[in-house]
């Protein structure tokens, strides 16, 4: 992948749009199809005041931890769906798209050099544990996915891409 492909805002917007479409397809978060068990996901709420003051290395840690947990969550949802008696085709399609999207985004971030930010010297303070929450519907899962992309991921890539432009 070209090193700065993720710096083209249209790339991230495409994945955000896919996640929002998936959320809409699941017919609302109150009455939509439920997960047979609760799944742990990252808390996507961004404290903008705190985020702006974080070093880019700290932001990278939050983004990588979030991406990792989100990938696990969607794979878990895929497994739950596979074990259900009659999984809706559209739901399977959106789960597959989300898994593919997360893999692509992970690759694009690696190419951007974001993983280098994680190599902190041994004497640095360990990162605060990732805040998490649980979801019980596919709609909520897709909403978390969309919010993570348009929140922490977008803010982080924006900062890294801006630095690279200088």
């Amino acid at each position: 992948a070209p090193p700065r492909l993720i710096c083209d805002s249209r790339v991230l917007e495409r994945y955000i749009l896919e996640a929002k479409e998936a959320e809409n397809v699941t017919m609302g978060c109150a009455e939509g199809p439920r997960l047979s068990e609760n799944i742990t996901v990252p808390d996507t709420k961004v404290n903008f005041y705190a985020w702006k003051r974080m070093e880019v290395e700290e932001q990278a840690i939050e983004v990588w931890q979030g991406l990792s947990l989100l990938s696990e969550a969607i794979l878990q949802a895929q497994a739950l769906l596979a074990n259900s008696s009659q999984p809706p085709e559209t739901l399977q399609l959106h789960i597959d798209k989300a898994i593919s999207g997360l893999r692509s985004l992970t690759s694009l971030l690696r190419v951007l050099g974001a993983q280098k930010e994680l190599m902190s010297p041994p004497d640095t303070t360990p990162p605060a544990p990732l805040r998490t929450l649980t979801v019980d519907t596919f709609c909520k899962l897709f909403r978390v996915y969309a919010n993570f992309l348009r929140g922490k991921l977008k803010l982080y890539t924006g900062e890294v891409c801006r630095r690279g432009d200088r």
């Epitope: 903008f48 705190a50 003051r53 977008k154 803010l155």
Partner: antibody, heavy 116, light 109 residues
Framework: QVQLVQSGAEVKKPGASVKVSCKAS????????MSWVRQAPGQGLEWMGW????????NYAQKFQGRVTMTRDTSISTAYMELSRLRSEDTAVYYC?????????WGQGTLVTVSS | SYELTQPLSVSVALGQTARITCSGD??????VYWYQQKPGQAPVLVIY???KRPSGIPERFSGSNSGNTATLTISRAQAGDEADYYC???????????FGGGTKLTVLG
Amino acid sequence: QVQLVQSGAEVKKPGASVKVSCKASGYTFTSYYMSWVRQAPGQGLEWMGWINPLKGNTNYAQKFQGRVTMTRDTSISTAYMELSRLRSEDTAVYYCAREGMYFDIWGQGTLVTVSS
Amino acid sequence: SYELTQPLSVSVALGQTARITCSGDSIGDKYVYWYQQKPGQAPVLVIYDTNKRPSGIPERFSGSNSGNTATLTISRAQAGDEADYYCQSWDLDFNTYVFGGGTKLTVLG
């Protein structure tokens, strides 16, 4: 104590520019972002933009893009907000506000009157 | 761009509970801040991170947030609570802060 002291009231003609200053004291100026918020008479609060005093980078509300410029002078711990091409609707009290975990410290406000 | 909508005014009887709402698309997915402003004064924060109180703010002030509505609740309303109240959050699409239009709280009696 921690405080933000703003420059005095201004009267300007339409089309002119105004530059409001905000002097910080009692804390490390470069450790906190600074936002500017305005309030027209009898109206609500309107966020205009922020500046990072350490690096000088800024982000402006869409509404003010192209008309507002936020700068700082770290040597005197002062932030500035300049608004150009003034119109009568720009008549307002302009506040600087320090960003801690929220807008925790506010200046006393500067009344800018735009009148022909 | 992201918008926050508040009722223009809310009235409450002295000693009763006032609720001020702030509506915005999926605001439940964001942190919300509430500011109190009295005439001729700069705003003062009463709730941050949706439901936390800064030191010096009475326990009577609380906040909640779910779905498309955030709420500031003032229990046992006092005459001194009369003020304008503003909710605030941010627009992640532009990395900008957003204020609601403000609500004038009147304490009757």
